[in-house]
């Protein structure tokens, strides 16, 4: 039950996280005009990964896409790449994790397969979250560097009558959305990995031993409270009672860490 809850919660948290990563990637407010010295401005600039915009005091907003690929800063390209990789991995992770959910029955899929899929999706979520956090952090670092550079330029006057006041940019809402979303995806991935451990605990498997009784022959297959580890196909987790005794060869299909004859 706890395993199912952990897996389900991990899936939901990751789903929210990936939705957040997609939202952050699409948002225009990765960087916004710094209004520290001038809280009321006639022209408010903000920029995203794909386009830059201006909101005028008139209420009109106009955006302009970055129609060049080669002319863009390498850092921006890197951030785009990180975010896209994060989204792609997250999307694949979500797809895998849907089939891995314990509460969803798909044909005769073994719990062992579900455990493996849970682990795979968990790792994908972790990498996806790290990609998003890395992308946002790289962009934030770029902003901080540019902020101080433009601040320095702002106070080294032009000498003449004409001033060129550089627009300084600070952190936009998308950065915070990205950090939170990346963190959630990461947490969701960790939860999926924990759930996988619950689905596949380290345990001792006993080789089936045949007991020959005077009446009915009973073959006892150990497995007690095992969920499923990929080591056996007894998915119902109950003792197998058979009319006749099994040969040792027949039971050999259940390998275990320690063989007791």
């Amino acid at each position: 039950m706890a395993v199912t809850a952990c897996q389900g919660l991990g899936f939901v948290v990751s789903l929210i996280g990936i939705a957040g990563i997609i939202a952050a990637t699409c948002m225009d407010q990765w960087s916004t005009q710094d209004l520290y010295n001038n809280p009321v401005t006639a022209v408010f600039n903000y920029q995203g990964l794909w386009r830059s915009c201006v909101r005028e005091s008139s209420g009109f907003t106009e955006c302009r896409g970055y129609f060049t690929l080669l002319g863009l800063p390498a850092m921006l390209q890197a951030v785009r790449a990180l975010m896209i990789v994060g989204i792609v991995l997250g999307a694949i992770g979500l797809l895998v994790s849907i089939f891995a959910l314990k509460c969803i029955r798909i044909g005769s899929m073994e719990d062992s397969a579900k455990a493996n899929m849970t682990l795979t999706s968990g790792i994908m979520f972790i990498v996806s979250g790290l990609c998003a956090i890395a992308g946002v952090s790289v962009f934030a670092n770029m902003l901080v560097t540019n902020f101080w550079m433009s601040t320095a330029n702002m106070y080294t006057g032009m000498g003449g009558m004409v001033q060129t006041v550089q627009t300084r940019y600070t952190f936009g809402a998308a950065l915070f959305v990205g950090w939170v979303a990346g963190g959630l995806t990461l947490i969701g991935g960790v939860m999926m990995c924990i759930a996988c451990r619950g689905l596949a605990p380290e345990e001792t498997n006993y080789k089936a031993v045949s007991y020959h009784a005077s009446g009915h022959s009973v073959a006892y297959k150990p497995g007690g409270f095992k969920a499923s580890t990929g080591f056996g196909s007894n998915t119902k987790n109950k003792k197998i009672y058979d009319g006749g005794a099994r040969t040792e060869d027949e039971v050999q299909s259940y390998p275990s860490k320690h063989d007791y004859v």
Epitope: Q33, N38, V40, T41, A42, V43, F44, N45, Y46, Q47, S52, C53, V54, E56, S57, S58, G59, F60, E62, C63, R64, V162, Q163, T164, V165, T167
Partner: antibody, heavy 118, light 113 residues
């Protein structure tokens, strides 16, 4: 068609107050900011401030912060500008104008001449 | 505040001739977000309110004849009337729409020679 109709000319004594109105029609009143600009006789244009009819949000030129008060009556689609503590140098034609894209003023009222004279 | 300086103060041209009015801003009017210049040109005839001619430095308002052309970027802007007509006699103003307070140039008076 878009129209901004201003109130008639006013003659006031120094120290008095005057309230100039600007009635808008022909467009969605609450969607556009309305500006006020003044022009002293034979002089250039001077921006006073602007008001947004939907929330009565204002932007005022600091030179006029103690002089002009901008208000809105959405029920009549009218913008008001009250000028206080009038002095002779406040004698001017006062225009209201709608703010358009590019922070440009696309439609103007006919102007209201305010004369301050003792 | 941004200071807008127009030149010349007055200009006399013959009918059909080209007229050029310059406007210099004390600060760049270029918005980095959309690469637009927030400069507007107005025409004011005697006894009338100003009329919008050009916004965003080069975008003609609807109904404005194509003989009026705006150009320039950053701090230096020009209004050109390619072939002056009698009805173009007016005072022309440039305006900063980039930052508060919005400021106007002192005006350039266009007359017919």
């Amino acid at each position: 068609q878009v129209q901004l109709v201003q109130s008639g000319a006013e003659v006031k004594k120094p120290g008095a107050s005057v309230k100039v109105s600007c009635k808008a029609s022909g467009y969605s009143f609450t969607n556009y900011w309305v500006n006020w600009v003044r022009q002293a006789p034979g002089q250039g244009l001077e921006w006073i401030g602007m008001v947004h009819p939907s929330g009565s949000e204002t932007r005022l030129n600091q030179q006029f912060k103690d002089k002009a008060t901008l208000t809105v009556d959405t029920s009549t689609s009218t913008v008001y500008m009250e000028l206080s503590s009038l002095r002779s140098e406040d004698t001017a034609v006062y225009y209201c104008a709608r703010v358009w894209s590019g922070n440009a003023f696309d439609y103007w009222g006919q102007g209201t001449l305010v004369t301050v004279s003792s | 505040d941004i200071v807008m300086t127009q030149s010349p103060d007055s200009l006399a041209v013959s009918l059909g001739e080209r007229a050029t009015i310059n406007c210099l801003s004390s600060q760049s009017l270029l918005a980095s977000g959309n690469q637009r210049n927030y400069l507007t040109w107005y025409q004011q005839k005697p006894g009338q309110p100003p009329k919008l001619l050009i916004y965003w430095a080069s975008t003609r308002d609807s109904g404005v004849p194509d003989r009026f052309t705006g150009s320039g970027s950053g701090v230096d802007f020009t209004l050109t009337i390619s072939s002056v007509q009698a009805e173009d006699v007016a005072v022309y103003y440039c305006q900063n729409g980039f930052s508060f307070p919005f400021t106007f140039g002192q005006g350039t008076k266009l007359e017919i020679k």
